[in-house]
């Protein structure tokens, strides 16, 4: 414990001190004192620096004293040989001898006493920022006007801290200012703007005096701004060493004013605003802004439109345009949208063609559609050149996004009909020189392919029969054989309405619109042995001359057969209309003048014996295009004759043309528009 | 396929808080703006505020501001909000929402009730 | 922040009906406008986006028009699964706000 007095003396004391001892005496006085210790009696070996026998005194780690040999007083009043004085309240005192005394000697007494230190003035380190007051056993701390005392009980500062700015303009400076500002201070002050609002500060450099920096550059009073994880300083000296206009980032920012013990400046004064948060002015690629403006703020707001071909997609949807505002935290929002190239997708596949697969279906993309050949050819022009355009559609540049249409190419035969040996009339030939040819079993008849739906025939051929089958692609009409070939089902028998129906059509005389439109159930298709024949043009080069050269071809009666079972073909002229009637009629179910001539008759033949007969109806009667000689076209239907082997007559197909071609779009599907 | 599941009902007392989350599966949350919306029972919807998983960039409602808190865990590809200080009027069905363009997938809703 | 207020607050109809609801937003939001549906114990579900554009799923009879700060949603002729609560939303600047609802009943 403790205490304010007591003694110490060396062992035995005042007998000799016994040798090759070592004791120690740990002095402790109350706290706010220090220690007073005084020998009264000292006689201990003499030796240099002590070595032998010792009395130490030792505070903390330092040693006060190390006493030897013998001392008296100088003082006759007092009895004190040596004494010590210490600040603080602890000390140890020491006592050490060695093996062998020369003599005898008696040692020491010693005495301490608590004594009264003045904090104040007794330390190098002053305890008080400003006054110190020393008492009995301590001190205490004390300020001047306007200074308060620090937890510490030691500082002093000014009260300067806990204002919060909120305004959106104002101004702070040190305390003081411009009188000098207060030492030994932390002064903290809170600007909090709105959110969406950055704290901009103005300093002028005539504002600011601050203790400048020491030796190395470190300022001993500081001005410092945070605002979130960014720091601004700390700045000193004379005249504002930072940037006069500090754009903080932030709403929020907090103004921390340091001071040291010493230093008398003036301090300095700021101005402070809030600036709508700025957005930076991005670069968004495919896309312009809407306003475009040098500088955006907080609560702008702008319209991002993608360029032609751009869009923005969101799962199977896009848009073109998006808004986008400047947000609190200096931030666009929907900054995830991008303008994106726009996705055609994998284009349309077409009927009877093929588009190549594209290397890439994004704007610009360029696909090319082809159409088989030689079968077909593309109807509606354009090349078949697609390009991705920017609403998302493949688009030809005379088409726009209609698809290209594959037709079947008309009236050009993969062989051409060469007449062989002769075979009493006609010559053989194959399918391939007359693709275009209908095979009719009930009645036996020909009948001409003029598209992928439609069938031309002899309204004869079809009057008793509305539902006929139908066959294309073979040479040979033999049961083993059609059933190699492409059987087709009709859906609709269209009569022209010109043909009159009889009670009894065997006793015709009159075959005046002997055609007829078979519509098919499917879409025939096409290939070297199966192709249309074209249909005359509506010009006057479609208008027959006598001597014109046809080709007809079927299945019907020979010299030798009532049927054939392969394909024959002729080739004869056009004759005047006269020839057919001067021949008698073979076998007459009424009076020769009683049988019907009209401008819708060719009459053919008579060359050679070559005709058409019984079971040839409806065929095509096929001249060489005059505009284009690669290609035939059916002048005519083989309709009737006096007799097999003269002249017969053909349906002039010039005469319908307008029919036919009402008749077909009228009862398109769909799938042909 | 596209889908957001979120956490199921809470009930809490006035002065908590609670944490609800919402899964994503069928695509990256990163790509995507994360949204909150509530429906107190037999009201409108409230849009609370979103968050950018890609940079954990925040706005919230200014009703909300201060209270609420959207996080985002793109390791599990999972959104969470947190609402602090609650009180009765907060009793409501909580929905999370994906967007780019508009909000095309909402999750089931979770229904937190505050009740003392 | 844009209040949008939707008209009417509820609205009774049959089957086959044409129907028009109206949301009219307190400043210009351009089309940054999206309308959605919800039904009892159901997540909202888009309908129309950005003021005109019908979401993909969506039958044709919903339809949305307007620019600004006025717009409607018409449903040319209802169907028995069209009665729900209709809210639009506006998407031009946060925070985003909802109208406060139109509930479509059976007459």
């Known amino acids: 414990e403790p205490t304010m007095y007591g003694e110490i003396l060396s062992p035995n004391y005042p007998q000799a001190y016994p040798s090759e001892v070592e004791k120690s005496w740990d002095i402790e006085v109350p706290e706010g004192y220090g220690i007073h210790l005084y020998f009264t009696h000292l006689d201990i070996e003499l030796s240099e620096n002590c070595a032998y026998d010792s009395v130490q005194i030792i505070s903390g780690d330092t040693e006060e004293g190390r006493l030897c040999g013998q001392r008296s007083s100088n003082n006759p009043h007092s009895p004190i040989v040596e004494e010590f004085q210490v600040p603080y309240n602890k000390l140890q005192v020491i006592f050490k001898s060695d093996f062998s005394n020369e003599e005898r000697f008696t040692g020491f007494a010693a005495y301490y006493v608590a004594t009264d230190i003045n904090e104040c003035t007794d330390f190098v380190d002053v305890p008080c920022s400003h006054f110190c007051n020393n008492f009995i056993g301590g001190y205490f701390c004390s300020c001047p006007p306007e200074y308060f005392l620090h937890d510490d009980m030691k500082n002093c500062g000014v009260n300067c801290s806990g204002d919060v700015f909120t305004a959106l303009i104002g101004e702070i400076a040190s305390p003081n200012y411009p009188k000098p500002y207060p030492e030994n201070s932390r002064c903290e002050y809170q600007i909090r703007l709105e959110k969406g609002f950055q704290v901009v500060v103005t300093l002028r450099r005539e504002d600011f005096d601050v203790e400048a920096a020491d030796s190395a550059g470190n300022c001993l009073d500081s001005l410092v701004f945070v605002a979130g994880d960014r720091q601004f300083g700390p700045y000193c000296g004379h005249g504002f060493p930072g940037p006069l206009n500090i754009e903080t980032k932030s709403n929020a920012l907090d103004i921390i004013f340091q001071t040291d013990l010493t230093g008398q400046k003036k301090g300095w004064k700021l101005r402070y605003h809030g600036d709508p948060m700025p957005c930076p002015k991005e670069d968004t690629p495919n896309s312009v802004w809407e306003p475009a403006k040098a500088k955006y703020v907080f609560r702008d707001v702008v319209k991002i439109t993608c360029l032609d071909g751009f869009e923005v997609v969101e799962g199977r949807v896009g848009a073109t345009s998006f808004y986008s505002t400047c947000q609190s935290n200096g931030k666009w929002s929907n900054s995830k949208l991008k303008c994106q190239p726009v996705d055609c997708g994998i284009p349309e596949s077409i009927e009877n063609g093929k588009v190549e697969d594209p290397e890439s279906t994004l704007f610009g993309s360029v696909i090319r559609y082809t159409c088989e050949e030689p079968y077909y050819y593309m109807e509606n022009g354009g090349g078949g050149e697609y390009h991705c355009a920017g609403n998302g559609s493949w688009v030809n540049e005379v088409l726009g996004p209609e698809l290209p249409k594959c037709v079947p190419v008309c009236g050009v035969p993969r062989e051409p009909f060469e007449e062989k040996q002769r075979i009493i009339g006609g010559s053989d030939a194959d399918i391939k020189n007359f693709p275009w040819q209908v095979f009719f079993d009930n009645p036996w008849a020909g009948g001409a392919l003029i598209n992928e739906y439609w069938v031309l025939t002899a309204a004869h051929v079809v009057e008793g029969n509305r539902e006929p089958t139908m066959y294309v692609g073979s040479t040979s009409v033999q049961t083993s054989r059609l059933a190699k070939s492409k059987m087709l089902t009709p859906e609709h028998v269209f009569i022209h309405p010109g043909w009159k129906l009889l009670e009894v059509p065997e006793g015709r005389t009159n075959f005046d619109n002997d055609i007829a439109l078979v519509r098919l159930k499917d879409p025939v298709k096409m290939g070297p042995t199966v192709s249309p024949i074209c249909l005359p043009g509506t010009s006057s080069d479609y208008n027959l001359m006598d001597g014109d050269l046809g080709l007809i071809s079927g299945w019907g009666r020979t010299e030798k057969r009532d049927r054939a079972v392969r394909l024959k073909a002729a080739r004869l002229p056009v004759a005047p209309l006269r020839k057919c009637k001067e021949v008698k009629v073979e076998k007459p179910t009424a009076d020769a003048e009683a049988y019907v001539f009209t401008p819708n008759m060719i009459c053919a033949g008579g060359e050679k014996g070559m005709d058409s007969c019984k079971g040839d109806s409806g065929g095509a009667f096929a001249v060489q295009d005059p505009n284009d000689k690669t290609k035939f076209y059916a002048a005519g239907l083989v309709s009737w004759g006096p007799q097999c082997g003269t002249y017969g007559l053909y349906t002039r197909v010039k005469n319908y043309v307008d029919w036919i071609m009402k008749t077909m779009q009228e009862n398109s599907t769909p799938r042909e528009d | 396929q596209v889908q957001l599941v979120q956490s199921g009902a809470e009930v809490k007392k006035p002065g908590a808080s609670v944490k609800v989350s919402c899964k994503a599966s069928g695509f990256n949350i990163k790509e995507y703006y994360m949204h909150w919306v509530r429906q107190a029972p037999e009201q409108g919807l409230e849009w609370m505020g979103w968050i950018d998983p890609e940079n954990a960039d925040t706005i919230y409602a200014q009703k909300f501001q201060g209270r609420v808190t959207i996080t985002a865990d793109t390791s599990t590809n999972t959104a969470y909000m947190e609402l602090s200080s609650l009180r009765s009027e907060d009793t409501a069905v909580y929905y999370c929402?994906?967007?780019?363009?508009?909000?095309?997938?909402w999750g089931q809703g979770t229904l937190v009730t505050v009740s003392s | 922040d844009i209040q949008m207020t939707q008209s009417p607050k509820s609205l009774s109809a049959s089957v086959g009906d044409r129907v028009t609801i109206t949301c009219r937003a307190s400043?210009?939001?351009?089309?940054?406008l999206d309308w959605y549906q919800q039904k009892p114990g159901q997540s909202p579900k888009l309908l129309i986006y950005s003021a005109s554009y019908r979401y993909s799923g969506v039958p044709s009879r919903f339809s949305g028009s307007g620019s600004g700060t006025d717009f409607t949603l018409t449903i040319s002729s209802l169907q028995p699964e069209d009665f729900a609560t209709y809210y639009c939303q506006q998407q031009y600047t946060t925070p985003y706000t909802f109208g406060q609802g139109t509930k479509l009943e059976i007459k």
């Open positions: 929402a994906r967007s780019r363009l508009f909000f095309a997938y």
């Open positions: 400043q210009d939001v351009r089309t940054a």
